[in-house]
């Protein structure tokens, strides 16, 4: 239904706390360089204005669209051109072009320092002094670094953060209570960020139809007892929610997500038997819980997929009558039977099925042509299964750090032109798949591995898009989202690459490395490893292992030495010489 004042409607629906949080996220995702105080001031002004509209929907400007209201606020910021350059040109446009322009200027890799966590005492002090401001800082810092973070989900993580601080700041040993819990939230939030970015990429590059297909597959796996009409309704609603969030319409997105959660909880009987626990929770926890609810038990009496999609004489007729519905039904039926497959794989199978029907239904004898389609799925299924087995075996053998290094070598060989920081970030993230997925039961490994890798590779593509340097990467990133991971996996050593010349300073280290946290030490070592591969792309695994072991030994020795600086300055050049010899 239409509301006289959109802003009053959303304020009433969401409540002041969530309204303010979402407006803060929206502003922080659009203008990523502004300080918290600048954004907090804007948020307060917008909230005060919303309250006047709640009191009187006919008040001046209350009938304006949210894009108009928010855009006008952003465009009124002083020194916009000095701080944001050409983004200021967006302000010369009218809605909806102005909002589109803001979206295009979102930076997936803003030049902001890493979000450093203050030490426990300081954190607890500022949290106790003003919990609202403290959480506002959290929303601002995460949102500006992750301009596509799923806004209602970020509110959920802020709530988690709040609960952890409330609990741990009351403990004697705040540090040991906070660190593991906040690390856990950070890890989950980072995964949530890359997953959501993938959804927005899908929506931006391939439109709503592509996202809806993703949603149908995912929902059918989770709710195999729901009928096709129910799955279609949920997929349509979920597509709307994600379209809104990806488009910067965060108030509508959060409101519609709450509506969807309400609908699911009111219709559990036709959706899934596993929803009750989620539905007993308050809003943010409920929606989060529903988004990762366990798969319902599959119906026992499902007929073979071939009956309706291969053996039925009506296949081409049904396909002609309603292509999207027929393909949607195929995707639904196949997905509900295969919770053990990744969504990417299911979409590849649906694409193969569609291509087969396109070819076969045009022939004189279609059934003879499409009769073997299910057998033709086999190689498509085997490829990711082999990928999971090979990689999980390697992870179990090497551990997370060693596995990351193996991936780093592999990907530097595939795309040596890519910047070392990007390669290291990608390899570290790709390597985490082992810890995240390889410990799961067999039937959960494939969906976990492939869908996580796809999300990480999407980030690689986004970063590469900004400064394209590798034809290999461009080729894999240009295709459809579901083909990316197989494309990257199939890449081999880039034969066109001219090796980087050996620079001693790249491999020169100083005693300050000794005091770095373990994670930073690893990044330094992995940076050196990538540079080695760029120098010798065809170095054997054995050669690289020799050099890296020598490097680790050198660090260990010098960091234990009484005079660290002397050790680094004398042993360092020797290490460089040995490295050159080992790789000669």
């Amino acid at each position: 239904e239409a509301h006289k004042s959109e802003i009053a409607h959303r304020y009433n629906d969401l409540g002041e706390q969530h309204f303010k949080g979402l407006v803060l996220i929206a502003f922080s995702q659009y203008l990523q360089k502004c300080s918290y105080d600048e954004h907090a001031k804007l948020v307060q002004e917008v909230t005060d204005f919303a309250k006047t509209c709640v009191a009187d929907e006919s008040a001046a400007n209350c009938d304006k669209s949210l894009h108009t209201l928010f855009g006008d606020k952003l465009c009124a910021i002083p020194n916009l051109r000095e701080n944001y350059g050409e983004l200021a040109d967006c302000c010369t446009k009218q809605e909806p072009e102005r909002n589109e322009c803001f979206l295009q200027h979102k930076d997936d890799n803003p030049s902001l320092p890493p979000f450093e966590r203050p030490e426990a005492e300081a954190m607890c002090t500022s949290f106790k002094e003003n919990p609202t401001t403290f959480m506002g800082h959290y929303l601002h810092e995460v949102a500006r670094r992750h301009p596509y973070f799923y806004a209602p989900e970020l509110l959920y993580y802020a709530e988690q953060y709040n609960e952890i601080l409330t609990q741990c700041c009351a403990e004697a040993d705040k540090e040991s209570c906070l660190t593991p819990k906040l690390d856990g939230v950070k890890e989950k939030a980072l995964v949530s960020s890359v997953r959501q970015r993938m959804k927005c990429s899908s929506m931006q590059k391939f439109g709503e139809r592509a996202f809806k297909a993703w949603a149908v597959a995912r929902l059918s796996q989770t709710f195999p007892n729901a009928d096709f009409a129910e799955i279609t309704k949920l997929a349509t609603d979920l597509t709307k929610v994600n379209k809104e969030c990806c488009h910067g319409d965060l108030l509508e997105c959060a409101d519609d997500r709450a509506e969807l959660a309400k609908y699911m909880c009111e219709n559990q009987a036709t959706i899934s038997s596993k929803l009750q626990t989620c539905c007993d929770k308050p809003l943010l926890k409920k929606a989060h819980c529903l988004s990762e609810v366990e798969h319902d038990t599959m119906p026992a009496d499902l007929p073979a997929i071939a009956a309706d999609f291969v053996e039925d004489q009506e296949v081409c007729k049904n396909y002609a009558e309603a292509k999207d519905v027929f393909l949607g039904t195929f995707l639904y039926e196949y997905s509900r039977r295969h919770p053990d497959y990744s969504v990417s794989l299911l979409l590849r199978l649906a694409k193969k099925y569609e291509a087969t029907l396109e070819k076969c239904c045009a022939e004189a004898n279609p059934p003879a042509c499409y009769g073997t389609v299910l057998a033709e799925f086999q190689p498509l299924v085997e490829e990711p299964k082999n990928l999971v087995k090979t990689n999980c075996d390697l992870y179990e053998k090497l551990g997370e750090y060693g596995f990351q290094n193996a991936i780093l070598v592999r990907y530097t060989q595939k795309a040596p032109q890519v910047s070392t920081p990007t390669l290291v970030e990608a390899a570290r993230n790709l390597g985490r798949v082992g810890t995240k997925c390889c410990t799961l039961p067999e039937d959960q490994r494939l969906p976990c591995v492939e869908d996580y890798l796809s999300a990480i590779l999407n980030r690689v593509c986004l970063l590469h898009e900004k400064t394209p340097v590798s034809e290999h990467v461009t080729k894999c990133c240009s295709g459809s989202l579901v083909e990316r991971r197989p494309c990257f996996s199939a890449l081999t050593v880039d034969e066109t690459y001219v090796p980087k010349e050996f620079k001693a300073e790249t491999f020169t280290f100083h005693s300050d490395i000794c005091t770095l946290p373990e994670k930073e030490k690893q990044i330094k070592k992995q940076t050196a490893l990538a540079e080695l591969v760029k120098h010798k792309p065809k170095a054997t695994a054995e050669q690289l292992k020799t050099v890296m072991d020598d490097f680790a030994q050198f660090l260990d020795t010098c960091c234990k030495a009484a005079d660290k600086d002397t050790c680094f300055s004398t042993e360092g050049p020797n290490l460089v010489t040995r490295c050159k010899d080992a790789l000669a």
Partner: nanobody, 115 residues
Framework: DVQLVESGGGVVQPGNSLRLSCAAS????????MSWVRQAPGKGLEWVSS????????LYADSVKGRFTISRDNAKTTLYLQMNSLRPEDTALYYC????????SGQGTLVTVSS
């Protein structure tokens, strides 16, 4: 919505000819192979002939081979069945269908061969 409208049936004497037409709409005609099927009084559906989307490939049931010719005009989105040397056993309701479907989509057109 997919629509198939058959026409051209009638009463003919054995040995004579008829040309059936099927006007198609509501789908991408060139993307689909088309067939003619028939149902004699008191009998089940029987496949008669098929043609590929481009019109380059054709198939016939043994009972009509050499007498019937299937063709299509993709510009007019119309399917044809030229029936020569008709026999009494060709008497049936004739339907055009999409793909290899053995189903009645349209109303059909009645062909009666009798002396």
């Amino acid at each position: 919505d997919v629509q198939l409208v058959e026409s051209g049936g009638g009463v003919v004497q054995p040995g004579n000819s008829l040309r059936l037409s099927c006007a198609a709409s509501g789908f991408t005609f060139t993307s689909f192979g088309m067939s003619w099927v028939r149902q004699a009084p008191g009998k089940g559906l029987e496949w008669v002939s098929s043609i590929s989307g481009s019109g380059s490939d054709t198939l016939y049931a043994d009972s009509v081979k050499g007498r019937f010719t299937i063709s299509r005009d993709n510009a007019k989105t119309t399917l044809y069945l030229q029936m020569n040397s008709l026999r009494p056993e060709d008497t049936a309701l004739y339907y055009c269908t999409i793909g290899g479907s053995l189903s009645r989509s349209g109303q059909g057109t009645l062909v009666t061969v009798s002396s």
